[in-house]
Structure formats: C-alpha cells, structure tokens
Amino acid sequence: KFSKQSWGLENEALIVRCPRQGKPSYTVDWYYSQTNESIPTQERNRVFASGQLLKFLPAAVADSGIYTCIVRSPTFNRTGYANVTIYKKQSDCNVPDYLMYSTVSGSEKNSKIYCPTIDLYNWTAPLEWFKNCQALQGSRYRAHKSFLVIDNVMTEDAGDYTCKFIHNENGANYSVTATRSFTVKDE
C-alpha cells in the first residue's frame, strides 16, 4: 500500500509523489534506500526532493532503485517507498508493456483518455497526443486540458495512446511522455 511503482524514460522528466500522504504542513525527507543517502532539496541538483515530490530532471537509467520518503508531523513519522525504474528509450515505435499505464475503456458516449501522472507536473498546453506513434489529426480528436476526447468512437479507435507534454522547472523545459491502452466497449 505504501510502496508505489513509478517508471519513466531516460532524458525525460519524472516526478514521483510519496505514497504516504500527509497534511500540507508536514515535512518530508527523501532517501535513496540502498545507501540511506539523503536526497538534496536544492533545485540545482538533477535529482532533488521538493516536499511530497521527488523530481528527476531529467531521469537517468542509473536513478533506478527504491527511494524512501519519511513524512514527519509534530508527533508522528510515517514511511513510504517509491520503487523507481528508468528505462532506455526504444528505437522503434512499440511501447513495451512495462511502460504502459492502466488501460481505459471508452464508448460512443464517453471517450475521455486521461494523460497519466500529468497532475504532478508543471505543464502548459498544448498537450500532444499520438496513437501507435502517429500524431492525431482531424476534428474527431480534441485535446482538452489533461484529456483526449474522441468524438464518434469506433472500434478502430482502440490502441495505444501516448500523451506528450513539457514540464517547466525554473525556466528549464523537460519532455514527458506517458502511454496507455484504450479499448472500445459497446454501450
């Protein structure tokens, strides 16, 4: 419950939230579990902690491992674990299963595809969408906030959808991509 799997691609931004939630006023300390080394909070570091969030800007394959977050209230300390895996970028179009977020289902009346993890990032529109690596074009596709809406959904719309956006941190931009499968169900 308080261990969470997170994954990302090398040279992209990855932001992980401590699985152990606390009130906003509580302090959070992050450690690299294997070495018990404290994660710095200074933003000049490529990997740094920012309250409930652990930021990899950008991520490297060597960052993979288990990170411990300790949330501290005035009287209680509670621990969570983030199991982070950073993968090399694939040269071909296929997105392997281990990089896929949960599958969503849609129908003619409800065809929203939410861009996974986007709420953790400081992003601004536009949000780009791809299906099986092809940029989506045409009036049936509408990028709305953090969703993709498909009008008049058809069986052929099933497939793997990737959202791509830019995370901004102190004026520096980092790319993020996330992919999930979309299935079409009958009403």
Partner: antibody, heavy 123, light 107 residues
C-alpha cells in the same frame, strides 16, 4: 496542551434522545478529523462515528447509522454527537478522540482521548 | 468489516517477565494497525502506530511487529504500571475496528 472534554451524558429512556458535546483545546481543531468511540460497561472499544476536518465528511458504524449524527462547529472548537432513538445497547461510556494525521480517504490512530461521558439507556 | 481477534484473552504474568500479545486480522491491513493500553476508569492510551512505531513518550520496553494479518505487541519486561487491558485497532478502512482486548494481570 491538547485537551478533550466530553459532556452531555446521563440517564435517558429507550427511544429518547441525547446530545453529547466534546470541547477541544490546545490544537487547531478545524484541521483534524474527530471520532466518537464507545465502551459498554465491562466490554471493549467500539468505533461509533468519524467526521473529517474542514471538509466535514462523515462516517458511521452500522449499529448507529440513521440514529446518530456527528457534527462539528469549528468556530467553537466543539464536536457533537446527536443520539436519537436510543436503545439499551447504546449504554456506554462515550469518548471523543482525535485522529492526528488522516488525509482524505484515509484514517489513522487516535492520539488524544477525552475522559468519557456515561450514557445510560434504561426505563 | 475487518474483524480483529486478540489472544490470549488474559495473560497472567509477574513483574519483570516478558509479555507477548497477539492480534490477528480477518483480512490484510498492511501495517495500518495500532495498539492501545487502557487502565480501569481511564481512556485508552496510544502505544504503537503503523504496526511497529512507538508513539511519543512510550517506553522502549513496548514494541510492535507484524504486517498483513498477524501482529504482536511485546512488553520486554513488565513494570507494575503495565498491568492493564491492551487493544489492537485497524485503520486501513472504515469501519475502524478494535480487537476484543487482552488483559495483562499480575500472577
């Protein structure tokens, strides 16, 4: 120093009503979830009801659902339990307690308890 | 609802002895389990949270262990003030539930 002080207990006939209060001090009452727990004479502890902090979402044990109402007045630092249609099996010491951590959708332990107020339901 | 079963119901021991109390959950509660101590005429007092962490001000002789469905509270060497009733409580989901209690009495 955190303090919780219950009041409002007493003897009431079956089918009657009672309103318990819990005055809180020594902490920022509005941000904490608050809980009522009861203990029948010589028995164990039973969770009765919880109320979220500023959001005010409420939860009830099946045994009291529809009869008891938990509420709070953050401006008065006071927790309430309105008890209607009381039964003999509601006879217990009623404690109010603080959940020092919980976030929306989760619960935690009870770190501070009041001294309790006795409710006796009998004819 | 999650049922917590404590054993034994009563534990008769002498001061200085080790007390081992058990709490078993009807389904997994991860580490969302607490232990409380209650003395006659008093409100319960929190001892252990998240299965194994001592609450502020609780002596080191109290320790908790376990995860999932099986938990243990250990008092390494009983002091006279430790004779009381002990309850476990799960907080993974509502309704919050308590065990029926274990009474630790003087032998």
């Amino acid at each position: 120093e955190v303090q919780l002080l219950e009041s409002g207990g007493g003897l009431v006939q079956p089918g009657g009503s009672l309103r318990l209060s819990c005055a809180a001090s020594g902490f920022t009452f509005s941000i904490y979830d608050m809980i009522w727990v009861r203990q029948a004479p010589g028995k164990g502890l039973e969770w009765v009801s919880s109320i979220r902090g500023e959001g005010g979402g409420t939860y009830y044990a099946d045994s009291v659902k529809g009869r008891f109402t938990i509420s709070r007045d953050n401006s008065k630092n006071t927790l309430y339990l309105q008890m209607n249609s009381l039964r003999a099996e509601d006879t217990a010491v009623y404690y109010c307690a603080r959940d020092p951590w919980s976030t929306e959708g989760s619960f935690f332990v009870l770190d501070y308890w009041g001294q309790g107020t006795l409710v006796t339901v009998s004819s | 609802e999650i049922v917590l079963t404590q054993s034994p119901a009563t534990l008769s021991l002498s001061p200085g002895e080790r007390a081992t109390l058990s709490c078993r959950a009807s389904q997994s509660v991860d580490d969302d389990l607490a232990w409380y101590q209650q003395k006659p005429g008093q409100a319960p007092r929190l001892l252990i949270y998240d299965a194994s962490n001592r609450a502020t001000g609780i002596p080191a002789r109290f320790s908790g262990s376990g995860s999932g469905t099986d938990f243990t509270l250990t008092i390494s060497s009983l002091e006279p003030e430790d004779f009381a009733v002990y309850y476990c409580q799960q907080y993974i989901t509502a309704p919050l539930t308590f065990g029926q209690g274990t009474k630790v009495e003087i032998k």
